[in-house]
């Protein structure tokens, strides 16, 4: 039977080493057996490269393409093939479709004067364009009370957040996670980091009186 694309490939770049494209077929497909995504940088002498897609769901395919350290001028020609049949053709400019890498190593430490210090790592090396462009969103939620959550926007450079213990319920277990975006690249948000959990053992002042 004929092979058709239901939702055209949507691609994002981490702007350092990888671009990921995802698309949906009109019926369940063995992506790696039936499809190939070819990609070629629009640059003199560039060779054609092939990505073997994997299944994300029955009819959703995803392809991870290694790319060189991206620069603004890079434009890739993409062609989706089912054997000799060209299913889709398009172009992709990584600098216009950035999805930052996920921040890593989120930890929580008790700090002076009843505060918690949340720390994480910038996912980019200092020499990468995005290293100094990231801002973060930190989500802090009560593990036992879905209504008790807070969102903090970290717009300064350092990957840290100081949190007053008094803003959280005493004796409750909290989880935090963090994600990043790059405003100057009009990026999408990164995936959320894995959560880290801690017990907020701050005693309200009333209990001291």
């Amino acid at each position: 039977g004929s092979v058709k694309v239901l939702h055209e490939p949507s691609c994002f770049s981490d702007y350092i080493s990888t671009s990921v494209c995802q698309w949906k077929m009109d019926h369940p497909t063995n992506c790696s057996a039936e499809l190939r995504l070819s990609y070629q940088l629009d640059f003199m002498g560039s060779e054609n490269h092939t990505c073997v897609p994997e299944n994300r769901e029955d009819s959703v395919c995803v392809c991870s393409m290694p790319i060189d350290d991206a620069v603004e001028a890079d434009v890739y020609q993409l062609d989706l093939w089912a054997g000799q049949q060209l299913l889709w053709s398009g172009s992709f400019q990584p600098s216009k479709h950035v999805k930052p890498r996920t921040p890593g190593n989120l930890t929580v430490h008790p700090n002076i004067s009843h505060t918690w210090l949340l720390m994480w790592t910038n996912p980019y090396p200092t020499e990468n364009h995005l290293h100094s462009e990231l801002t973060y969103m930190v989500n802090v939620s009560n593990d036992n009370d879905p209504e008790d959550f807070k969102v903090y926007n970290v717009t300064y450079m350092g990957p840290t957040l100081r949190l007053a213990a008094s803003t959280l319920k005493s004796g409750a277990s909290y989880s935090a996670r963090v994600r990043a975006w790059a405003q100057t690249y009009n990026s999408t948000w990164s995936d959320w980091s894995p959560s880290t959990t801690w017990l907020n053992y701050y005693e309200p002042w009333e209990q001291h009186l």
Epitope: L41, F43, M44, G45, E47, I67, D68
Partner: antibody, heavy 125, light 112 residues
């Protein structure tokens, strides 16, 4: 030591054909694009053609498009230039040169970093 | 197509002096920060051309530091300090950014 040795230059009549060869050694031939550049007697350098490392991409100067064909045999470390429908204005010394590294996604550029000694093509009746 | 224009077309310099050659392109050769696809070549009398500078300012292997390239976008300069008799020949700039690749007309350097 990198070496490029051109051959195949000759005296040929207008409308005739010729095939130039360039044998490479001292580097990983298949990883690099290769270029032909020519120089008419007493004139400057003129780019002719480029072929990527795999041979999958080729580029030509307008003056030779449709008449010249660049190709390569990576098993023999040899670059070729097939020249058909030759004209008097094709008379020149033809040089082969090593161009950009094309095994990477974005070719790495070092200029034309090694040149052959050249082979003379004369087109005259 | 990108047109390359060199000035001057000939230059006479005394040994020990500095020679400067200018090259202008009809379009920007800057692909990304620090990557200007502009080369300089020297063709000595009776010899094949040899690479001097690539990517605007990077010296090719074995090229003495008397040779330096500068510039960005459309305007570039080759400077040869402490000129020697051995530097005589024709100097060419070339853009390597897009097809068709193109050379400047060449600048003939003569040592007085």
């Amino acid at each position: 030591e990198v070496q490029l040795v051109e051959s195949g230059g000759d005296l040929v009549k207008p409308g005739g054909s010729l095939r130039l060869s360039c044998v490479a050694s001292g580097f990983t031939f298949r990883d690099y694009a290769m270029t032909w550049v020519r120089q008419a007697p007493g004139k400057g350098l003129q780019w002719v053609s480029l072929i990527s490392g795999s041979g999958g991409k080729t580029y030509y100067a307008d003056a030779v498009k449709g008449r010249f064909t660049i190709s390569r045999d990576n098993a023999k470390n040899t670059l070729y230039l097939q020249m058909n429908s030759l004209r008097a204005e094709d008379t020149a010394v033809y040089y082969c040169a090593v161009d950009r590294l094309t095994k990477t996604i974005r070719p790495q550029y070092y200029g034309l970093w090694h040149w052959g000694q050249g082979t003379l093509v004369t087109v005259s009746s | 197509d990108i047109v390359m224009t060199q000035t001057p077309l000939s230059l006479s310099v005394s040994p020990g002096e500095t020679a400067s050659i200018s090259c202008r392109s009809s379009q920007s050769l800057l692909y990304s920060i620090g990557y200007n696809y502009l080369d300089w070549y020297l063709q000595k009398p009776g010899q094949s051309p040899q690479g001097l500078i690539y990517l605007g300012s990077k010296r090719a292997s074995g090229v003495p530091d008397r040779f330096s390239g500068s510039g960005s976008g459309t305007d570039f300069t080759l400077r040869i300090s402490r000129v020697e008799a051995n530097d005589t020949g024709v100097y060419y700039c070339m853009q390597g950014l897009q097809s068709p690749l193109s050379f400047g007309q060449g600048t003939k350097l003569e040592i007085k």
